[in-house]
């Protein structure tokens, strides 16, 4: 029991999750492309989810998508419309901790 406790505590010691940079608010123009960046790091590597106005983001082929990056995740919206205005939040978890950041797309 003692050795297994030591192993798990070592694992806990190596586990971390950090929001490296808060998300910026973005003001842009109709028809343009906007990119929102979720900059997080962690161990185990975090899972990142995107929300708009407190609801899971709906991906739209060739227009709205998100993908993993070396720094976390990037959400890209092409051909911006007024309907895209709102709060965009990324939520990252490594299974133990959760961090989030919110930006506004004006």
């Amino acid at each position: 029991p003692t050795s297994s406790w030591n192993i798990s505590s070592e694992l806990n010691k190596d586990s971390y999750l950090t929001l490296d940079e808060p998300m910026n608010n973005i003001t842009t123009s109709l028809g343009q492309t906007a990119e929102l960046h979720c900059k997080v790091s962690g161990n185990p590597p975090p899972t990142i989810r995107w929300f708009k106005n407190d609801a899971p983001v709906v991906q739209e082929p060739r227009r709205l998508s998100f993908r993993s990056t070396i720094y976390g995740s990037r959400l890209r919206i092409r051909n911006l419309d007024t309907t895209d205005t709102g709060y965009f939040q990324c939520v990252a978890t490594n299974g133990k901790e959760v961090v989030s950041s919110t930006g506004v797309l004006f």
């Epitope: 608010n25 003001t27 708009k52 106005n53 407190d54 609801a55 899971p56 983001v57 709906v58 007024t82 309907t83 895209d84 205005t85 709102g86 709060y87 939040q89 919110t102 506004v104 004006f106």
Partner: antibody, heavy 119, light 107 residues
């Protein structure tokens, strides 16, 4: 206690102007979006305009664009709706409401103020 | 704009009845749907947000659910104070759009 209190409604002739006020209290005004929603007599709810009080960004429904202007004075915790070139179809109860940071669900509403456009 | 088609437009029910009101979005609005109750001469009140989250202070007989683009408000056991008009609202896309309302009347 959270309160939103509208004022400034009344009877106005077609083509006339009115300015509605929405006085907020009981919460930190500049971390909310303030909305104006209207309801014509016996009809449903229609979004009119909103303003991010912390960023100044505004949105207008097509039906009022170019005629109505929404603004906010964070020092007075008050939002305004300037209504110009009023039409009979603008007759409605006008409500101000707020949505918390992160969502557009409207969690508090004022009691409403009636605007009647008639000759 | 996104259309929110609400049904029925009115219904008659008795105290104690289970009441279901539905809204269908014209395209996906994720879970960004709220439900409001409005009584005559009064402002709307928020009941449900994020499709299924009960707003603070709202009785637990109210519940919301989602299946794709279909959203449902359920009142498990209708009380005398529940006779009112109910509206759904999507707020995923700007501008948020409301359903046309459902009036719940006494049978």
């Amino acid at each position: 206690e959270v309160q939103l209190v509208e004022s400034g409604g009344g009877l106005v002739q077609p083509g006339g102007s009115l300015r509605l006020s929405c006085a907020a209290s009981g919460f930190t005004f500049d971390s909310y979006v303030i909305h104006w929603v209207r309801q014509a007599p016996g009809k449903g709810l229609e979004w009119v305009a909103y303003i991010f009080s912390f960023g100044g960004y505004t949105y207008y429904a097509d039906s009022v664009k170019g005629r109505f202007t929404i603004s906010a004075d964070t020092s007075k915790n008050t939002a305004y709706l300037q209504m110009n070139s009023l039409r009979a179809e603008d007759t409605a109860v006008y409500y101000c409401a707020r949505s918390p940071y992160g969502t557009f669900a409207l969690d508090y509403w004022g009691q409403g103020t009636l605007v009647t456009v008639s000759s | 704009d996104i259309q929110m088609t609400q049904s029925p437009s009115s219904l008659s029910a008795s105290v104690g009845d289970r009441v279901t009101i539905t809204c269908r979005a014209s395209q996906s609005v994720s879970s960004a749907v709220a439900w409001y109750q409005q009584k005559p001469g009064k402002a709307p009140k928020l009941l449900i947000y994020s499709a299924s989250s009960l707003y603070s202070g709202v009785p637990s007989r109210f519940s919301g659910s989602r299946s794709g683009t279909d959203f449902t408000l359920t009142i498990s056991s209708l009380q005398p104070e529940d006779f009112a008009t109910y509206y759904c609202q999507q707020y995923y896309y700007t501008p948020g759009t409301f359903g046309q309302g459902t009036k719940v009347e006494i049978k």
